[in-house]
């Protein structure tokens, strides 16, 4: 945020920006939460625009039966590996392809055992409030699908009829990690000193990191004629005096006619 | 860039025998599997037998006693003896490998593929 400065108080200026503003020689340049000529006034609101994809990952461990092990397939860059990776890959598109918040697999490490096979399962869905509830039902679904393949797709006399066969008891799920996105929170952090008073609203499921001197939202602080201005001891109405009004009050509610108070004065006199 | 290339198909009477050959390059055959699968008109392709780095073979039941698969390190080929053919073999012969040890019949296991070959088994 940057507020351009001409003639000859502008020297002045650059000595006098504040809450961190630096000048860059026209103008002070301020950090994210402030704006003004000097960097003196307080954001009303704060992007915290939330990622567009909120991801998880779950890793798993499963046991293909249908393919021996071998030295080469402990080597990532072996053809072996890549040829074990890409028909890995292409089963587990079958095995979760109907469910829409997953996007692949990423083979870790294949060691002996048959072929032990230590991988992540990667999940993505939209931002919205309730991606938690989302991920969550989609790792339960992977549990499903992938107990269920693992005892339906095994080997009969030492022969696999499908794509790739496994082991029923070699089926584990290690560990999931759900990236954390938490508004609240980053909206607390972004406003600094100023933690207390902003707060989280939703507009079309998009989070607004806000200031009661935001406009349009329900905790927007009506000023009337006035300026709302952000402090330390919170949110204030900065009244303004029109031509023929002063304005009082908390929220310059108050309108006392100028002409009232100079004839009062007047006739005092 | 592997190439698998199959011959020896052929008409054949009842009863007779046929041997087709695959021969493969830029594959090393000593390591991996090598298969044989057909496809007869109207029908999905199907594994017939294959045979391992070491040797392991295996054969669908419906050919097993009849043929029998081999390879041939050294000339980095793969056989198929086929005897006592009957109507029901006519399919058209693919020769397929993979660099893993696999222990499975199924096509989608397979990543190098030949042309085929035509065997048509009819009196």
């Known amino acids: 945020r940057t507020t351009t400065c001409f003639g000859d108080g502008c020297q002045n200026t650059a000595s006098r920006c504040k809450n961190g503003g630096t000048w860059d020689g026209l103008k002070c340049q301020c950090p994210n939460l402030y704006y003004g000529e000097l960097c003196e006034e307080v954001v009303s609101s704060i992007d915290i625009g939330p990622p567009e994809t909120i991801s998880a990952q779950m890793e798993l461990t499963v046991t293909v039966t249908s393919v021996k092990f071998t030295e080469e397939l402990k080597n990532h860059s072996s053809q072996e590996f890549q040829e074990f990776k890409q028909t890995f890959t292409e089963q587990m598109n079958i095995v979760y392809s109907g469910i829409p918040e997953y996007v692949g697999v990423n083979i870790t490490k294949l060691r002996l055992g048959s072929v032990v096979v230590e991988h992540d399962v990667l999940l993505r869905t939209k931002y919205t409030p309730e991606y938690k509830t989302v991920l969550d039902n989609a790792t339960e679904v992977v549990k499903e699908k992938i107990t269920k393949v693992t005892t339906q797709q095994i080997m009969i006399n030492d022969i696999c009829s499908d794509m790739m066969c496994f082991n029923t008891t070699g089926t584990q799920v290690q560990n999931i990690t759900v990236t954390q996105y938490d508004p609240e929170e980053d909206c607390r952090k972004m406003a600094k000193e100023y933690g207390d008073y902003f707060v989280v609203e939703y507009r079309d499921q998009k989070p607004y990191c806000i200031s009661p001197c935001e406009p349009g939202f329900s905790v927007s602080k009506n000023c009337n004629l006035g300026k709302c201005q952000m402090s330390l001891s919170g949110p204030q109405c900065l009244c303004v005096t029109t031509e023929t009004h002063w304005y009082s009050g908390e929220t310059c509610n108050q309108g006392t006619q100028k002409s009232l108070v100079y004839g009062h004065h007047h006739h005092h006199h | 860039e592997v190439q698998l290339v199959e011959s020896g198909g052929g008409l054949v009477q009842p009863g007779g025998s046929l041997r087709l050959s695959c021969a493969a390059s830029?594959?090393?055959?000593?390591?991996?599997?090598m298969a044989w699968f057909r496809q007869a008109p109207g029908k999905e392709r199907e594994g017939v037998a294959f045979i391992n780095s070491d040797g392991r073979t295996s054969y669908a039941e419906s050919v097993k006693g009849r043929f029998t698969i081999s390879r041939d390190n050294a000339k980095n080929s793969l056989y198929l003896q086929m005897n006592s053919l009957r109507a029901e073999d006519t399919a058209v012969y693919y020769c397929a490998a993979s660099l893993l040890y696999l222990m499975t019949v199924n096509a989608a296991a397979y990543p190098y593929w030949g042309q085929g070959t035509m065997v048509t088994v009819s009196s």
């Open positions: 830029g594959f090393p055959s000593s390591r991996g599997t």
